[in-house]
C-alpha cells in the first residue's frame, strides 16, 4: 500500500490546482477508487479563483474533482499517487508560482491533543484571501485500522468515517475522536475541500496519533527566590500525560541590565542565578514529549514576578527549638544596592541583633545566624518573629519570618488489659500557633525491644490519629507485638517544610494498664472490727502485681484513704477503721510490681453491710423523773435515756435491760425491749439502777449506774446557780459547789420551759467544770426552770433549782456582730464574775 506522506508528519502544506487542459482526468486520492461521490459539508474558507493563463473560471469547472498534493516550504516536489493497482508513483515537479496562482493552497498542522482523546487538524490558507469567498466546505475522512498491512488493496471507501470541519474566514479545524485504546494505531485520512462547486482532495495520509501528541500548556507557573538567592521558576507536572516531557522556558529579565533567555529542561523547575532586588521577570513555559516526537504545546500564559527592594533568602524559616537558623539579605535603596557591611539586623523591630551574629557573604549579601533557638511566643495575631534587615539609617517595612516550634511532644502509650491493642495519645498544644500545619504520627517497629537511642528512619509508617474532645490525638495500634519496640515521633508538615519531634520508643509490654481486680468484697469483721477487703487478680498480665486499696465512708463526697499491698500473692487485706457501724465503699486497683506500666482503673465499688461487730461499747446515759410526794418514802421513778448511737452500740441495739440492786431485794433485771424509758417504785433507802444495751453479739460491758438514796437526796452540794441568755439559741449556766465528803461523779443539768408542754431536757456534764453553754431554742421572755443535780457515787444529791433567767438590771446592747446581746460583762456582778468576756466571745463564735 503506497501512501503519500507530508514532509513533516504533523505540519505540511497542501497545494491544490486544476489540471492542464491536456490532462484526461485528475487523479483520485491515493488508493481510493475513483467513482466516489463528492462529499457534503459546510465551509467558509475556500475561494473563487480566476485562472489568468487560461481565462477559465473555477465555477465553469463544477463537478470536477481536482487533485492536491503535499509540498515543502518552497512548493517543490509536489507529489501525488496514482490510483493504479501497481502502486507506482506519478510525481511531477511544479513550480510554486503555479500553485500560488492557479490553486487553493493550505498550511496544515495536525496533532494529538494532550489528554489523548482527540486528533486535531488545523488549516489556514497560505494566501491572505486573494479570492472572493464562496460557501466552502471541508471534510476529513479517516479510518483507524489496527495494522495497515491487513487493509484491502485498495482500501474501501466505505471503511472511512467523515467529520465536518469547523471553518471561519481565516481557518478550519477538524476534530477526530480517537478512542484511548487506539492511540497507537495508524490513522488513515484525507481531506476533501469543496468550494463553489469545485472539489479538491488531498492524498491519503497515514499518522500514528501517539507520535504527534501536542501536550496542554503547563499550569501553575510560579516563581520564588530560593534560600540561596536564586530565582526558582517552577510549574506543575502534567499527571495526565503517560510519557515523560521536556519543557522550554523563556524569560525576560528586566534588571540593571535586560536579558532574554530560553532554556530546555526535563525537570519541572529552572534556576536563574544572581537575582537582584528590584528586578522583574516575565516567564512562559511550554512542553513536548521528552523523546522529541510530537508537537510543542502552546506557551503558558505569561507570569510576571518582581523582586522586592529588600530581598530575604530564605524569606521564611520554620525550625525547631534548640536549632540554628540563618537569613541572608540584599538591600537596594534608591536604585543602589547597599554594601553588606552597612547592613544591621533587628528582631521584631524591638531589639537589635548583636553584630557577632552577622556574616558577610559577598559585597552585597549579609547573613545573620541564630543559635539554640527558643520557641516563638505568639504576639497577638503574629505567630512568628519578624527579622528585619536594615541599613544603618532605616529599616525597610519588609521582613523575614522566623517560626520556631517546640517539637518536644510527649507521646504516651497504654496497652489495654487484654494485651490486644496499644493506644497512644499526644497533644499538639505546643504547635498550635503554627497555622496551616498538619500533624501526623509516624513510626517504625523493631522486631524485639527498643534501641538504646531511638532514631527517625526514612522508611516509616503513618498512623491514623483521631482528635479527641480534650484536645489530644489518639492513635490505636492493633494488633500489637508485645515485645517489639515501636519508635514513634510526630511529624509537623507545613508549606515551609516539615519538622519531627524527638523519637520515643515504646514497648507495649512495658505500658500495660491491667484490667482492674475483680470480685472485690468488703466486710467489717466481727470482734476484731477490721475492714477486710478481698479480691481476685486479673488474668493479664502474667507479671507479679501490686495492689492499692482505697476506702472511705460512703456518701456524696468520699474522703478516700489508701492502703498499699506489695505482696503479689496476696488476695486480701484487713484495715483498721474509725467507724465500725458505717457503710464503707471500697475499690481496688493494680499495676505491675516492677513499676512498669500504669495503674488499672479502680474496680467496681464494694460496700460493707452494717452489722453488729462487737458488744455495745457502753450502755446508754440515763436520767430520771420523780413523781409523787417528796415526803413519802415510796416514789415512782421514771428512767429516761437516749437511744444509743451506732458508734456506741456497734452497731445496733436489740433491747435494753435495766438492772436493779437494793439491800433488801438484792439484784434483778427488767427487759425493756427497745423502749427508752422505764418506771419503777423506789421504796428502799438506796436503790441502784444500771441500763445495759444488748445487740446480737452481747451486752454492753461499760455501763452507767445511778443510785437513788434518801440520805443523799438531802446533801446540799450546789451553792449557787445562775442562768444568762446569750441569744435565742444559747444560755450560759454557771454555778459554785460547796465542799463535801462524797465522791462527785458528774453533774446533771435539767431545764424546761415552764410555759410550754415540751417536757424536761437534760445533760450529763463533767464534775470539774463550773459553767456550761446550753444550746437550745430559748425564748428570752418566757419562763424557764434550770436545775443542777450533783451525782455522787453514793447517790443523787439535792438539786439547785432556779426559775427564769437570773434577774439583773441588764442594759440591752448590740454586740460587735450586731446581734442582740442580752448580757454583757459589766452586767455580771459578784458571784457572776464566773462568766467572763471570754465566755461571751465563746458564744459568738460557737
Amino acid at each position: 500500500l503506497n501512501l503519500a506522506y507530508p514532509t513533516s508528519p504533523w505540519r505540511f502544506k497542501l497545494f491544490c490546482a486544476p489540471p492542464s487542459t491536456t490532462d484526461d482526468s485528475f487523479l483520485s486520492p491515493a488508493g481510493v477508487p475513483n467513482n466516489t461521490s463528492s462529499l457534503k459539508g459546510a465551509s467558509e474558507a475556500l475561494v473563487e479563483a480566476k485562472f489568468n493563463s487560461t481565462g477559465i473560471y473555477v465555477s465553469e469547472l463544477s463537478k470536477t474533482i481536482f487533485h492536491c498534493c503535499f509540498g515543502n516550504e518552497q512548493g517543490q516536489n509536489c507529489s501525488a499517487l496514482t490510483g493504479n493497482t501497481e502502486g507506482k508513483t506519478l510525481a511531477s515537479v511544479v513550480k510554486p508560482l503555479v500553485f500560488r496562482q492557479l490553486g487553493v493552497n493550505w498550511d496544515i498542522e495536525c496533532w494529538m491533543k494532550g489528554d489523548l482523546t482527540l486528533f486535531i487538524c488545523h488549516m489556514e490558507p497560505l494566501l491572505k484571501n486573494p479570492f472572493k469567498n464562496y460557501d466552502s466546505k471541508v471534510h476529513l475522512l479517516y479510518d483507524l485500522p489496527e495494522v495497515i498491512d491487513d487493509l484491502p488493496l485498495p482500501p474501501l471507501k466505505d471503511s472511512f468515517q467523515t467529520v465536518q470541519c469547523n471553518c471561519s474566514v481565516r481557518e478550519c479545524e477538524c476534530h477526530v475522536p480517537v478512542p484511548r485504546a487506539k492511540v497507537n494505531y495508524a490513522l488513515l485520512m484525507y481531506l476533501e475541500i469543496t468550494s463553489a462547486g469545485v472539489s479538491f482532495q488531498s492524498p491519503l495520509m497515514s499518522l500514528q496519533p501517539m507520535l504527534v501528541v501536542k501536550p496542554d500548556p503547563p499550569l501553575g507557573l510560579r516563581m520564588e527566590v530560593t534560600d540561596d538567592g536564586n530565582l526558582k521558576i517552577s510549574w506543575d507536572s502534567q499527571t495526565k500525560a503517560p510519557f515523560p516531557l521536556q519543557y522550554q522556558v523563556k524569560y525576560l529579565e528586566n534588571s540593571t541590565i535586560v536579558r532574554e533567555a530560553a532554556e530546555i529542561v526535563s525537570d519541572t523547575s529552572l534556576l536563574v542565578d544572581s537575582v537582584l532586588p528590584g528586578s522583574s521577570y516575565e516567564v512562559q513555559v511550554r512542553s513536548k514529549r521528552l523523546d522529541g516526537s510530537g508537537v510543542w504545546s502552546d506557551w503558558s500564559l505569561p507570569q510576571l514576578f518582581t523582586t522586592q527592594d529588600v530581598m530575604y533568602f530564605p524569606p521564611k524559616i520554620l525550625t525547631s527549638v534548640g536549632s540554628n537558623a540563618s537569613f541572608c539579605c540584599i538591600y537596594k535603596n534608591e536604585n543602589q544596592t547597599i554594601s553588606s557591611k552597612q547592613i544591621v539586623w533587628w528582631m521584631n523591630l524591638a531589639e537589635k541583633i548583636p553584630e557577632t551574629q552577622y556574616n558577610t557573604v559577598s559585597d552585597h549579601i549579609s547573613k545573620v545566624t541564630f543559635s539554640n533557638l527558643k520557641a516563638t511566643r505568639p504576639r497577638g495575631k503574629f505567630t512568628y518573629d519578624a527579622v528585619y534587615c536594615c541599613n544603618e539609617q532605616a529599616c525597610h517595612h519588609r521582613y523575614a519570618e522566623l517560626y520556631v516550634i517546640d517539637v518536644n511532644i510527649n507521646i504516651s502509650c497504654e496497652t489495654d488489659g487484654y494485651l490486644t491493642k496499644m493506644t497512644c495519645r499526644w497533644s499538639p498544644s505546643t504547635i498550635q500557633s503554627l497555622v496551616g500545619s498538619t500533624v501526623q504520627l509516624r513510626y517504625h517497629r523493631r522486631s524485639l525491644y527498643c534501641p538504646d537511642n531511638p532514631s527517625i528512619r526514612p522508611t516509616s509508617e503513618l498512623k491514623n490519629c483521631v482528635l479527641q474532645t480534650d484536645g489530644f490525638y489518639e492513635c490505636v495500634f492493633q494488633p500489637i507485638f508485645l515485645l517489639s519496640g515501636y519508635t514513634m515521633w510526630i511529624r509537623i508538615n507545613h508549606s515551609l517544610g516539615s519538622l519531627d519531634s524527638p523519637p520515643t520508643c515504646v514497648l507495649p509490654d512495658s505500658v500495660v494498664k491491667p484490667l482492674p481486680p475483680s470480685n472485690v468484697k468488703a466486710e467489717i469483721t466481727i470482734n476484731t472490727g477490721l475492714l477486710k477487703v478481698s479480691w481476685e487478680k486479673p488474668v493479664f498480665p502474667e507479671n507479679n502485681l501490686q495492689f492499692q486499696i482505697r476506702y472511705g465512708l460512703n456518701g456524696k463526697e468520699i474522703q478516700w484513704k489508701t492502703h498499699e499491698v506489695f505482696d503479689a500473692k496476696s488476695k486480701s487485706a484487713s484495715l483498721p477503721v474509725s467507724d465500725l457501724c458505717a457503710v464503707y465503699v471500697v475499690q481496688v486497683r493494680c499495676r505491675r510490681l516492677d513499676g512498669l506500666g500504669y495503674w488499672s482503673n479502680w474496680s467496681s465499688p464494694a460496700y460493707t453491710l452494717v452489722m453488729d461487730v462487737k458488744v455495745p461499747m457502753r450502755g446508754p446515759e440515763f436520767w430520771r423523773i420523780m413523781d409523787g410526794d417528796i415526803t413519802k418514802k415510796e416514789r415512782n421513778v421514771t428512767l429516761l435515756w437516749k437511744p444509743l448511737m451506732k458508734n456506741d452500740s456497734l452497731c445496733s441495739v436489740r433491747r435494753y435491760v435495766v438492772k436493779h440492786r437494793t439491800a433488801h431485794n438484792g439484784t434483778w433485771s427488767q427487759d425493756v425491749g427497745n423502749q427508752t424509758n422505764l418506771t419503777f417504785l423506789w421504796a428502799e433507802s438506796a436503790h441502784t439502777v444500771t441500763v445495759l444495751a444488748i445487740n446480737s453479739i452481747g451486752a454492753s460491758l461499760v455501763n452507767f449506774n445511778l443510785t437513788f438514796s434518801w440520805p443523799m437526796s438531802k446533801v446540799n452540794a450546789v451553792q449557787s446557780l445562775s442562768a444568762y441568755p446569750l441569744s435565742s439559741s444559747c444560755v450560759i449556766l454557771s454555778w459554785t459547789l460547796s465542799p463535801n465528803d462524797y465522791s462527785l461523779l458528774y453533774l446533771v443539768i435539767e431545764w424546761k420551759n415552764l410555759n410550754d408542754d415540751d417536757g424536761m431536757k437534760w445533760l450529763r456534764i463533767p464534775s470539774n467544770v463550773n459553767k456550761y453553754y446550753i444550746h437550745d431554742n430559748f425564748i428570752p421572755i418566757e419562763k424557764y426552770q434550770f436545775s443542777l443535780y450533783p451525782v455522787f457515787m453514793e447517790g443523787v444529791g439535792k438539786p439547785k433549782i432556779i426559775n427564769g433567767f437570773t434577774k439583773d438590771d441588764i442594759a440591752k446592747q448590740q454586740n460587735d456582730a450586731g446581734e442582740q446581746k442580752l448580757i454583757s460583762e459589766e452586767d455580771l456582778g459578784g458571784e457572776q464574775k464566773l462568766i467572763s468576756e471570754e465566755d461571751l466571745h465563746h458564744h459568738h463564735h460557737h
Epitope: 441568755p725 435565742s728 439559741s729 415552764l754 410555759n755 410550754d756 431554742n777 425564748i779 428570752p780 421572755i781 418566757e782 419562763k783 427564769g804 433567767f805 437570773t806 434577774k807 439583773d808 441588764i810 440591752k812 442582740q820 442580752l822
Partner: antibody, heavy 117, light 108 residues
C-alpha cells in the same frame, strides 16, 4: 378564763408621749412573759416589745428601740408600754399578748394609738 | 432578722373546700412556727404552735406541717367561720418575733 384588756390609746401629735396599760386576769401573771404587738390600719401584725416573767429581760423591735419602754407590775397583774417621741408610723392598734410557744397564745382586743399633726 | 413570706396573699374558696396556705422562712427555723387567725375587728387567735401542734380549743380541721423553711396550714373542709386573715410567725430566732404579711381568705 384568760383576759387581757388594753387601755391608754388616744390621738397624739408627733413627738408626744403616751403610756399604754394592759390588765391581765384568769392566769398566774408572774408565770408568763408578755408582749406588745401592733397592727397599723389595714396592715399586718408587727411585734413591738416583750418582757420576761420577772421583768429581768426586755426586748424591742428596731423600729421602736430607744423610744419605747416596756414594764410590768406583777403585784397589779399589769403590763405597760411607755411610748415617747411618737411618729406618724406608730399609728396602730396596740395589742398586749401572753407570751407562749415563742409567740402569743392569748391577745387583748387592742387600744388605738393615732399619731397625727 | 428572719423574713417570713406567705402565699398566696389572698384567696377565694367555698365552704367545704380544702385550703392550703404556705409560709416560707428566709432561713431554716426547724419547727419553730406558729399560725394565727384574725377576723376583722378582733384580736388574733393562736391556731397551731410548733409547726404542727394544735392549740387547745381549735377545731381539728386545722392542721400544720413542714420544717426547715417551708410550712403549710391546711383547712380540710372550709366552714363559714373560717373566712379570715391568717398569719404565720417564727419563734426560732427571737427577738425579734417576725410575722408573715398575712393571707386573706375570702368567700368565693
Amino acid at each position: 378564763e384568760v383576759q387581757l384588756v388594753e387601755s391608754g390609746g388616744s390621738v397624739v401629735r408627733p413627738g408626744e408621749s403616751l403610756r399604754l396599760s394592759c390588765a391581765a386576769s384568769g392566769f398566774t401573771f408572774d408565770d408568763y412573759g408578755m408582749s406588745w404587738v401592733r397592727q397599723a390600719p389595714g396592715k399586718g401584725l408587727e411585734w413591738v416589745s416583750g418582757i420576761s416573767w420577772n421583768g429581768g429581760i426586755t426586748v424591742y423591735a428596731d423600729s421602736v428601740k430607744g423610744r419605747f419602754t416596756v414594764s410590768r407590775d406583777n403585784a397589779k397583774n399589769s403590763l405597760y408600754l411607755q411610748m415617747n417621741s411618737l411618729r406618724a408610723e406608730d399609728t396602730a392598734l396596740y395589742h398586749c399578748a401572753r407570751a407562749r410557744y415563742g409567740g402569743a397564745d392569748y391577745w387583748g382586743q387592742g387600744t388605738l394609738v393615732t399619731v397625727s399633726s | 432578722d428572719i423574713q417570713m413570706t406567705q402565699s398566696p396573699s389572698s384567696l377565694s374558696a367555698s365552704v367545704g373546700d380544702r385550703v392550703t396556705i404556705t409560709c416560707r422562712a428566709s432561713q431554716s427555723i426547724s419547727s419553730y412556727l406558729n399560725w394565727y387567725q384574725q377576723k376583722p375587728g378582733k384580736a388574733p387567735k393562736l391556731l397551731i404552735y410548733a409547726a404542727s401542734s394544735l392549740q387547745s380549743g381549735v377545731p381539728s380541721r386545722f392542721s400544720g406541717s413542714g420544717s426547715g423553711t417551708d410550712f403549710t396550714l391546711t383547712i380540710s373542709s372550709l366552714q363559714p367561720e373560717d373566712f379570715a386573715t391568717y398569719y404565720c410567725q417564727q419563734s426560732y430566732s427571737t427577738p425579734p418575733i417576725t410575722f408573715g404579711q398575712g393571707t386573706r381568705l375570702e368567700i368565693k
